[in-house]
């Protein structure tokens, strides 16, 4: 079987301040088993934006119904965007374990923030 791919179709997204940003991500398989996480930035200083497995992320909602057993769409919506949210967002698949280990990352989506229309 083909190895799982993480697909972020949008290289960039531009959103007006105060609006919501939708960041798209799909995977091509449910295997290997493990959660999806979203990060802003790359490397050891990256910021966790959403963790499917646990945590409280009040500004983030999943776009599709993540409780479907066959769900492979892990797109998210981030509300009330501000200029501080600008950056590149990565959708990352983890393989389950103790601890979970990073398996594959999407190519990233660059979020830019436009001034709020007056």
């Amino acid at each position: 079987e083909e190895e799982l791919q993480v697909i972020q179709p949008d290289k960039s997204v531009s959103v007006a301040a105060g609006e919501s940003a939708i960041l798209h991500c799909t995977v091509t398989s449910l295997i290997p088993v493990g959660p999806i996480q979203w990060f802003r930035g790359a490397g050891p200083a990256r910021e966790l934006i959403y963790n499917q497995k646990e945590g409280h992320f009040p500004r983030v909602t999943t776009v599709s119904e993540s409780t479907k057993r066959e769900n492979m769409d892990f797109s998210i919506s981030i509300s009330n965007i501000t200029p501080a949210d600008a950056g590149t967002y990565y959708c990352v698949k983890f393989r389950k374990g103790s601890p979970d280990t990073e398996f594959k990352s999407g190519a990233g989506t660059e979020l830019s923030v436009r001034a709020k229309p007056s």
């Epitope: 290997p32 088993v33 497995k53 119904e65 409780t67 479907k68 057993r69 066959e70 389950k96």
Partner: antibody, heavy 118, light 106 residues
Framework: DVQLVESGGAVVRPGETLRLSCTAS????????MSWVRQAPGKGLEWVSG????????YYADSVKGRSTISRDNSKNTLYLRMSSLTAEDTAVYYC???????????WGLGTLVTVSS | ALTQPASVSANPGETVKITCSGG?????YGWYQQKSPGSAPVTLI????KRPSDIPSRFSGSASGSTATLTITGVQVEDEAVYYC???????????FGAGTTLTVL
């Protein structure tokens, strides 16, 4: 505190139909997938059916497929299981359970007893 | 189907391990305690190793490959119960349970 309270269990005759209910409180019901699990007298646990958070997607064990329907009313915080063509093999305590992000169970109701007897 | 031992026994204070196999690598595992037949199960562990906040720390879970293990460190008399392992398989979308392990505290 999370609470799940089942009702609707009864003594019924073979071939009859029954609808079980599970009323949820203490959490945002509409955000969670739910399942029904049963336990026949002297036996172990058996998963019966599951449903996604919105109710759009349903899943069934082979033992009940085609004669059971799981549904939910998120405005009433209530989960349902309608079972038809009941047989003695359906005699069991039926539990509703809240699903975790990966479709295991974290909270259970106290159960309701269904007895199928002529 | 998931396979677990029918029974285990231990003295108070000892460590007990209950294994569960057969789920494959596409599964997550949970552990459920039932103190009497027909009483509500209690979730001890889900997602292989996640313990709900109200469960005593003497209960822990782990998984390696297609085998999950429930460990009770310093078993107590009140831990006498039937312990079920449960699994969710991402290839079949189905939940399964083991037949249950009866723990007797001597």
């Amino acid at each position: 505190d999370v609470q799940l309270v089942e009702s609707g269990g009864a003594v019924v005759r073979p071939g009859e139909t029954l609808r079980l209910s599970c009323t949820a409180s203490g959490f945002t019901f509409s955000s969670y997938a739910m399942s029904w699990v049963r336990q026949a007298p002297g036996k172990g646990l058996e998963w019966v059916s599951g449903i996604s958070a919105s109710g759009s997607d349903t899943y069934y064990a082979d033992s009940v497929k085609g004669r059971s329907t799981i549904s939910r009313d998120n405005s009433k915080n209530t989960l349902y299981l309608r079972m038809s063509s009941l047989t003695a093999e359906d005699t069991a305590v039926y539990y509703c359970a809240r699903e975790t992000w990966n479709h295991l169970f974290d909270y259970w109701g106290l159960g309701t007893l269904v007895t199928v007897s002529s | 189907a998931l396979t677990q031992p029918a029974s285990v026994s231990a003295n108070p204070g000892e460590t007990v391990k209950i294994t569960c196999s057969g789920g494959g690598t596409s599964s997550y595992y949970g552990w459920y305690q039932q103190k009497s037949p027909g009483s509500a199960p209690v979730t001890l562990i889900h997602s292989d190793d996640k313990r709900p906040s109200d469960i005593p720390s003497r209960f822990s879970g782990s998984a390696s490959g297609s085998t999950a293990t429930l460990t009770i460190t310093g078993v107590q008399v009140e831990d006498e119960a039937v312990y079920y392992c449960g699994g969710y398989d991402y290839t079949t979308y189905v939940n399964t349970f083991g037949a249950g392990t009866t723990l007797t505290v001597l």
